[in-house]
């Protein structure tokens, strides 16, 4: 259930963060794993805050586990990770709020998909089951997602562990769909986040210590008007060596039409390390940090092979 408010969407998908409070090393590692999970499947980027005005702070507040939905703007905002919510899936869920998602079961169209069993709800917790106002939510054409990491479980805020508060109204593949998983982003979560942040249709986030990637359809040529972004992210403290082993793109002055661009960081405003076209292989590129951004654009219908690149963490 994505926010409909553009001001709540983080510009360029970049979310600066600070880990505050008294969190242990293992808790901090969980926070980083959860952020990397979001980065792996979407074009959202979590960057350690330097001087940005708007940023999130991992902290611990009276609400226990809670977060503002989307970007609040005008200063720091808390993502509270209290006792018993420092688990990977729960942090991924809370980061879902930061990214701009309300709970799935609060979608305005939820009554077509689930029943709320009001008599089983803990007294005083009924507000957790209210629907969002239609003008606050834009699900971007995505269907109701029982598998969403943003969905409550069947007995959330129940008066008894065996009493359901949310019941799916129909079967999916012959069974009542399970709800409330806190394992990983669902396909629907990923699809909706990619739409919310207008992620390029091609490219991916590469997080292994070695890997390779290529332009679409390589070596059989690429089509016009392609836009792909690959983000390479290795273990902090390591650097990346990037090698283009094949390059065959339409050659133009300043690589104006078709090009592959490498930036020393994790987003489109990071320092430019090179823009390449034609067939001359560039020298290997070594990052200054643990992240590189590679963007491919084509405008012509000229058919070259494209490119192939390999990288390695050093």
């Amino acid at each position: 259930a994505a926010t409909s408010r553009p001001e709540r969407v983080w510009p360029d998908g970049v979310i600066p963060f600070v880990i505050g409070g008294n969190f242990t090393g293992s808790q901090r590692a969980v926070f980083r794993q959860a952020m990397r999970h979001w980065e792996k499947h979407t074009c959202v980027t979590f960057l350690e805050r330097t001087d940005e005005d708007s940023y999130i702070v991992f902290t611990y507040r009276p609400c226990g586990c809670c977060s503002y939905v989307g970007r609040r703007g005008g200063g720091p905002q808390a993502i509270s990770i209290g006792k018993n919510c420092d688990k990977f899936g729960i942090v991924v869920h809370e980061l879902g709020h930061v990214v701009g998602f309300w709970h799935e079961h609060t979608r305005p169209d939820r009554d077509r998909h689930v029943s709320i069993v009001r008599e089983n709800i803990q007294p005083g917790q009924e507000y957790n089951f209210l629907k969002m106002e239609p003008q606050e939510v834009e699900s971007l054409g995505e269907t109701y997602d029982f598998d969403s990491i943003m969905h409550y479980a069947r007995n959330t805020f129940s008066r008894g562990i065996f009493l359901d508060t949310i019941v799916p109204k129909y079967e999916v593949n012959g069974v009542k769909p399970p709800i409330g998983q806190r394992t990983r982003l669902s396909k629907g979560d990923i699809a909706q986040a990619r739409k919310l942040y207008k992620c390029p249709a091609c490219g991916e986030t590469l997080q292994d210590s070695t890997g390779n990637f290529s332009s679409p359809e390589y070596p059989n040529g690429y089509s016009a008007h392609m836009h792909c972004v690959w983000r390479i992210s290795v273990t902090p403290g390591e650097k990346i060596i990037l090698n283009f082993t094949s390059l065959d793109l339409y050659r133009s002055r300043l690589c104006w039409y078709d090009y592959v661009e490498v930036r020393d960081g994790f987003w489109r405003k990071a320092p430019l390390r090179g823009r390449f076209c034609g067939s001359k292989l560039p020298e290997p590129i070594v990052s200054t940090d643990s992240r590189l951004w590679v963007e491919f654009r084509s405008s012509s219908n000229w058919v070259g092979k494209g490119f192939f690149a390999v990288y390695e963490a050093i």
């Epitope: 409070g21 009276p62 200063g75 720091p76 808390a78 005083g124």
Partner: antibody, heavy 122, light 107 residues
Amino acid sequence: QVQLVQSGAEVKKPGSSVKVSCKASGGTFSEWAISWVRQAPGQGLEWMGAIIPKFGTAEYAQKFQGRVTITADESTSTAYMELSSLRSEDTAVYYCARGAKYYYAEDYMDVWGKGTTVTVSS
Amino acid sequence: DIQMTQSPSSVSASVGDRVTITCRASQGISSWLAWYQQKPGKAPKLLIYAASSLQSGVPSRFSGSGSGTDFTLTISSLQPEDFATYYCQQALSLPYTFGGGTKVEIK
């Protein structure tokens, strides 16, 4: 204008319990964090714990964990702080204070009760 | 827990003086800091929140500054009603912690 009205002074024996109430009037109650802060004679301020009535669960300072219970009754807009196994060092003024609305970043205590004096003496 | 260290513990000053109180956090707390004023037998009163924002109804002679670990409360021209004890409080993370207090006394 929100006001927090606390219950009267208490004198308690060591080993017993005390329950202090804090009633909110003149504004919404359930979405705001209510903190409890104590001040021993001639000493500084010490945060004990907090509750957001709407959430129902309380968070406590480690020092008081197991000895303090903070609850809230939304129907009467009242928060309670119960401290058990009292000892002489618990002699203090106990304040309730309103903090953040739960979904906001700030958590500053802008409205305070007048305080409840609890004396622990045999 | 985040430790808050206030200095000085007391200061003697005259009406009209400029008074500065400092507060240091044991780790970075961004701008999540509050300053309170407390008079004998009374509850604390919020003066400054978010390190530098003046609480509604508080005179403009009070100002706050700082970010990260080091913060300052300044009273530009001390008035008779300002003689009190002042506390800083970090509002970043539970458990919330206060500085030890600074008593502003009449010289």
